[in-house]
Interface confidence: low
């Protein structure tokens, strides 16, 4: 039985030429996390695997930078960036969980960045 | 195409140390982690431990603690294994292998054979 | 350690046989994978995550299982099979090992 939630960033702004920490917490599972993929829509951005360390997908080694944590820094941002991340955490024994995170990248400076916790 | 090129075969003695290189090329170096494994002859294949190129993490078999060192050069896409105190049990075929998302090995090395004799 | 053990070491059989390996684990595994080694040559990836088979490997090769019990078949049995094969297992803790290899030999 899967019990547990992740808690994630939730919607947030960045502007644009600045970056962005995407970050999912899984809470509540004693389950072990093997793996946790970044995804863009249906693009691995990259992979943190528990044993093996960080995999960034060649096309974004650029603008991409493992953590801190289990999260992921988004550089260089554009108004392209704008849209959906997905945090899926992979774990033994529960099975798979993801998380939502909504990204809006501004070109004005009014940006707010908003975060449903503290990001360690 | 991705393709992992070993070091030649090499003679050690007992009490010695043989360092193996695995140039990598067709892909990313420093995106995928890159493993140790050996075959002595007639035996089954051994995981030795692994490097991860994009920060130089190392994990390592329990068995080769302490006598095994896993380095790499980014800018020569090169991964290097050290085996020291060498003994005639170390005589194998040592391979590198690329190591995929799912937790296996897609490309590997030609294998090094290192013999141990005095 | 997990110590996987495969079965048979060795077999003969013929062009056009059905044969199957097992490999089974002494705990319970998250991922099997199976390798394919000819003489001399390095081992190649040949089905990964118990059941996906790599690039250029036929269909007649197929894989299954679950927990500590793994299965390798060949439907039909071609000369270009002849060869040794490996289990190896990825569990949480390293180190993650490899089966002893079955040798698949012509009758």
């Known amino acids: 039985m899967m019990t547990g939630t992740i808690e994630t960033t939730g919607n947030i702004s960045a502007e644009k030429g600045g970056s962005i920490i995407l970050q999912c917490h899984l809470s509540s599972t004693t389950a072990q996390v093997t793996q946790v993929n970044w995804e863009q829509q249906d693009q691995l951005l990259a992979i943190c695997n528990a044993d093996l360390g960080w995999h960034i997908s060649p096309s974004f080694k650029d603008r991409v930078a493992p953590g801190p944590g289990l999260g992921l820094t988004l550089q260089s941002l554009t108004v392209n960036d704008t849209g959906e991340y997905f945090c899926i955490y992979h774990t033994y024994p529960d099975g798979t969980y993801t998380g939502r995170i909504f990204l809006e990248v501004l070109e004005s400076s009014v940006a707010e960045h908003g975060a449903r916790f503290q990001i360690p | 195409q991705v393709q992992l090129v070993q070091s030649g075969a090499e003679v050690k003695k007992p009490g010695a140390s043989v360092k193996v290189s695995c140039k990598a090329s067709?892909?990313?170096?420093?995106?995928?982690?890159m493993h140790w494994v050996r075959q002595a002859p007639g035996q089954r294949l051994e995981w030795i431990g692994y490097?991860?190129?994009?920060?130089?993490?190392?994990k390592y078999n329990e068995k080769f603690k302490g006598r095994a060192t896993l380095t790499s050069d980014r800018s020569a896409s090169t991964a290097y294994m050290e085996l020291s105190s060498l003994r005639s049990e170390d005589t194998a075929v040592y391979y590198c292998?690329?190591?995929?998302?799912?937790?296996?090995?897609?490309?590997w090395g030609q294998g090094t054979l290192v013999t141990v004799s005095s | 350690d997990i110590q996987l053990t495969q079965s048979p070491s060795s077999l003969s059989a013929s062009v056009g046989d059905r044969v199957t390996i097992t490999c089974r684990a002494s705990s319970s595994v998250n991922y099997m994978h199976w390798y394919q080694q000819k003489p001399g040559k390095a081992p190649k990836a040949w089905i990964s995550v118990t059941s996906n088979l790599a690039s250029g490997v036929p269909s007649r090769f197929s894989g299954s299982g679950s927990g500590t019990d793994y299965t390798l078949t060949i439907s039909s049995l071609q000369p270009e099979d002849f060869a040794t094969y490996y289990c190896?297992?990825?569990?949480?803790?390293?180190?993650?090992?490899f089966g002893q290899g079955t040798k698949v030999e012509i009758k």
């Open positions: 067709g892909y990313t170096f420093s995106n995928y982690v």
């Open positions: 190896q297992q990825w569990s949480s803790n390293p180190p993650w090992t």
């Open positions: 292998a690329r190591w995929r998302v799912n937790y296996y090995f897609d490309y």
């Open positions: 490097i991860n190129p994009y920060n130089d993490g190392t």
